[in-house]
Interface confidence: low
């Protein structure tokens, strides 16, 4: 027989021979990081027709760390369904649960024994601690100290000591997160109080107020002969600012000018009219309306000042 | 023979990337963790962390995480170290070096790579 | 980490002689503990593993021994070829840490 067959989990005893004589034994012993469990056969003998009789080395098995039981609220999942040195063992909490300690442990080889890379982590229930307080305004549950997984809480703002509203600016509700925090940012409470939008040959067509707080909408048109520069709906932002910025009207002009031809009255020049929700998250124009000479309008400035309590 | 042999010097610029390799033979690649230490110039060593080939699995000194990053391909037996967003810091000569199990309990660092210089200079 | 401080950093000894070097590790680090000799240019060698056991091909001239925070790696009887820098390591526990080395040059 030629040289005896090589296996990934052991080895040949002593040096190989080029070749054997028929009848010939070799043995073999588990290579280290391996284990032998009997009773399955380490060693082959050349056979009479110049073969090595079967032999494998499923009698050697690879070191394998110590079972780990599903943490309490969670699992132990071994990656690649095996315990052996080399591989990860993965926990994972159930909903409502978060991981105190390693995510991941490791099968390593302390020598040739196969011990965990640390201590298995534990399943903690998501606990949340009161959100924050805010500004001119309050949410439920102020009393409890600790809340719990998907609890949740509302925001709003206190009635307001002058002559304008607070607004509530943000998401009202917020809820206690899988890692042990908010869902969100609190809203604020403040006053919200944009300038009377004042568009010279043109007018308002709805909206109508003496007062515009946070949110309001105004929509012009133009006059006959003048054709709008600009959007025709604009609403009242969080900075008391429009947005977009207050139309113009503009003049229309002869048609051998290379200016636009006469528009209807009602047509605007942007291609589209943003909605309060899109031009929130958009760049805010640079623009800003000129003041208005509207008796008794104070400047947001001048507005209510946000104190705590 | 059991060998791990090492690329060869390398010289790059600050803020550059490196990799450096390490091909094992004599030996089933897949079986052993490969070790990587760092020694400056004058200095004393430092473990970097190791990757078992195996699996894919790897181990960092806390120091060298986000620095190295350890891979290996199996088909050609060879680890690999990458070093990011260098610095003089980074220097040095690495060394890559085979974990051997001596038996229950018992291992060592049994064959050393012969070293990869590794200077950061503009 | 634990912190390996070996001592002396560097020292003298003449041929016959016979040398002792120290590690104290910060920690008890249960005899994972290696030593190795490392040659101008050359890469490290391991001579000693788990505090006491020499390496296949090492010379017996080689020892080490100790336990919990203290070891140590003795010559019995210094050798031209010897002089070297020496380091321990520690590998019970992550990072796995060297101690600072120590020159061993012939008198």
């Known amino acids: 027989c030629e040289e005896p067959p090589t296996f990934e989990a052991m080895e040949l005893i002593g040096k190989p021979k080029p070749y054997y004589e028929i009848g010939e034994r070799v043995d073999y012993k588990c290579k280290k990081g391996y284990f032998y469990i009997p009773p399955l056969a380490t060693h082959t003998i050349c056979d009479r027709n110049h073969t090595w009789l079967p032999v494998s080395d499923d009698a050697c098995y690879r070191e394998t760390c110590p079972y780990i039981r599903d943490p309490l609220n969670g699992q132990a999942v071994p990656a690649n369904g095996t315990y052996e040195f080399g591989y990860q063992m993965h926990f994972i909490c159930n909903e409502g649960y978060y991981l105190i300690g390693e995510e991941i442990l490791y099968c390593e080889l302390k020598g040739s024994v196969a011990i965990w890379s640390g201590k298995p982590p534990i399943c903690e229930k998501v606990l949340c601690t009161p959100p924050p307080k805010i500004k001119n305004g309050k949410h439920t549950f102020s009393e409890v100290e600790v809340f719990e997984y998907l609890d949740a809480v509302t925001y709003s703002c206190d009635p307001a000591p002058g002559p304008d509203p607070f607004s509530l600016i943000g998401e009202s509700t917020i809820y206690c997160g899988d890692n042990s925090v908010w869902s969100r940012a609190a809203p604020e409470c403040k006053v919200v109080k944009c300038r009377f939008p004042v568009v010279e040959n043109g007018k308002q067509i709805s909206g109508f107020g003496k007062k515009f707080y946070y949110k309001a909408t105004v929509m012009f048109e133009c006059d006959k002969g003048f054709y709008l520069d600009g959007s025709d709906t604009i609403v009242c932002d969080s900075n008391s600012t429009w947005d977009p910025p207050v139309p113009k009207c503009l003049k229309v002009l002869p048609p051998s000018s290379t200016k636009p031809p006469a528009l209807s009255h009602s047509v605007s020049t942007s291609s589209t009219t943003k909605s309060p929700a899109s031009s929130a998250s958009g760049p805010r124009p640079t623009y800003k309306p000129p003041v208005s000479n509207y008796p008794g309008y104070p400047k947001p400035e001048e507005g209510i000042l946000d104190s705590l309590d | 023979q059991i060998q791990l042999q090492q690329s060869g010097p390398e010289l790059v610029k600050p803020g550059a990337s490196v990799k450096i390799s390490c091909k094992a033979s004599g030996y089933t690649f897949t079986d052993y963790y490969i070790n990587w230490v760092k020694q400056r110039p004058g200095q004393g060593l430092e473990w970097i962390g190791w990757i078992y080939p195996g699996s894919g699995n790897t181990r960092y000194n806390e120091k060298f995480k986000g620095k190295a990053t350890l891979t290996v391909d199996t088909s050609s037996s060879t680890a690999y170290m990458q070093l990011s967003s260098l610095t003089s810091e980074d220097s040095a000569v690495y060394f890559c070096?085979?974990?051997?199990?001596?038996?229950?309990?018992?291992?060592?660092?049994?064959?050393w790579g012969a070293r990869t210089t590794v200077t950061v200079s503009s | 980490g634990i912190k390996m401080t070996q001592s002396p950093s560097s020292m003298y000894a003449s041929l016959g002689e016979r040398v002792t070097i120290t590690c104290k590790a910060s920690?008890?680090?249960?005899?994972?503990l290696s030593w190795f000799q490392q040659k101008p240019g050359k890469s490290p060698k391991t001579l000693i593993y788990?505090?006491?056991r020499l390496v296949d091909g090492v010379p017996s001239r080689f020892s080490g021994s100790g336990s919990g925070q203290d070891y140590s790696l003795t010559i019995s009887s210094l050798e031209y070829e010897d002089m070297g820098i020496y380091y321990c390591?520690?590998?019970?526990?992550?990072?796995?840490?060297f101690g600072g080395g120590t020159k061993l040059e012939i008198k």
């Open positions: 390591l520690q590998y019970d526990e992550f990072p796995y840490t």
């Open positions: 920690q008890d680090v249960n005899s994972y």
């Open positions: 070096t085979r974990y051997y199990y001596a038996g229950r309990y018992d291992w060592y660092f049994d064959v």
């Open positions: 788990r505090a006491n």
